[in-house]
């Protein structure tokens, strides 16, 4: 059986947590880490469409960030492969009502955590 914890949503062998609270990007990742998870890593268009549909109209942080002049990277250190456009000039990415955008890390938003569902 798949083991998505209470309050997490299962989709394609992953579990997602959509916050009600708001935090900055760093604090959002710390929350996810406490749950043995990361800010969401989006691996397919189906996954992106699911997240956009499920999160509603609010902005939600995801696990993409960049240092000045550097490429976007996921939390796990892998480089972003331009699966979707990211608007804006910030260093951290979030999903809005149209797709992905970016903002400064200290701004507060809702967030999405993701982890693999652990089959037992």
């Amino acid at each position: 059986q798949a083991a998505c914890p209470e309050s997490w949503i299962g989709f394609q062998r992953k579990c997602f947590y959509f916050s009600d609270d708001t935090k900055n990007w760093t604090s959002s990742q710390r929350f996810c880490d406490s749950q043995d998870a990361d800010l969401a890593q989006v691996e397919s268009f189906q996954e992106l469409n699911f997240l956009l549909r499920y999160k509603g109209p609010s902005d939600h942080w995801i696990g993409l960030s960049r240092e000045q002049g550097q490429p976007w990277k996921w939390i796990n250190g892998t480089e972003w492969t331009r699966q979707f456009p990211i608007l804006g000039a910030g260093e951290c990415a979030y999903l809005n009502d149209k797709g992905a955008s970016s903002a400064r890390h200290y701004t507060e938003r809702k967030w999405i955590c993701s982890k693999s569902d652990i089959h037992v």
Epitope: D36, Q41, I75, I118
Partner: antibody, heavy 116, light 108 residues
């Protein structure tokens, strides 16, 4: 039923090394973040460190007393977690447990005694 | 490093009584980052409560967790013979995940 079966404990002299193993079965080990926790005789629990899943980068974090001496690794092809302990001290004497915090799974524990 | 202090060190009660165990943090811990474990002699710990108030799978309803900030409580509403054990709180607010020193619940 989920199992975490530990091995590799024993008696070692101060300054010596030991490697503990934790073999996982009946869950998707490769997706799990795993931890080591220890308990000195008659004392409380002490977190040793943890390793993330490969998809989360496979990174490790350690408690201050073991940083630089202990190394956590994993072999997902063998469903096995490891704790390499080097430069062992008498105060490292404890029962060592492997665990998956998120699901509440724990190994049976293995005793490591550091003594001359 | 966040230090967790549990009190009392030992709690002597009779079966059927209510047990209230305290866990105080040296700095604020989000309620999402605190767990409680039960341990019996010679056994591995057992997860009781995660995220301060959520019961783990298979844990009876007599166990409940509450609190926020720096003060957290584990309550056992009516002690059963099987509940006499040592209880630990653990925080996972920081990347070093510390435990309290434990509270032993023994039979009066």
């Amino acid at each position: 039923e989920v199992q975490l079966v530990q091995s590799g404990g024993g008696l070692v002299e101060p300054g010596g090394s030991l490697r503990l193993s934790c073999a996982a079965s009946r869950f998707t080990f490769s997706d799990a973040w795993m931890s080591w926790v220890r308990q000195a005789p008659g004392k409380g629990l002490e977190w040793v460190g943890r390793i993330k899943s490969k998809i989360s980068g496979g990174t490790t974090d350690y408690a201050a007393p073991v940083q630089g001496r202990f190394t956590i690794s994993r072999d997902d092809s063998k469903n096995t977690l490891y704790l390499q302990m080097d430069s062992l001290k008498t105060e490292d004497t404890a029962v060592y447990y492997c665990a998956n915090r998120n699901l509440g799974y724990w190994g049976q524990g293995t005793l490591v005694t550091v003594s001359s | 490093e966040i230090v967790l202090t549990q009190s009392p060190g030992t709690l002597s009660l009779s079966p059927g009584e209510r047990a209230t165990l305290s866990c105080r943090a040296s700095q604020s811990v989000s309620s999402s980052y605190l767990a409680w474990y039960q341990q019996k002699p010679g056994q591995a710990p057992r997860l009781l409560i995660y995220d301060a108030s959520n019961r783990a799978t298979g844990i009876p309803a007599r166990f409940s967790g509450s609190g926020s900030g720096t003060e957290f409580t584990l309550t056992i509403s009516s002690l059963q013979p099987d509940d006499f054990a040592t209880y630990y709180c653990q925080q996972y607010n920081s990347y070093s995940r510390t435990f309290g020193q434990g509270t032993k619940v023994d039979i009066k």
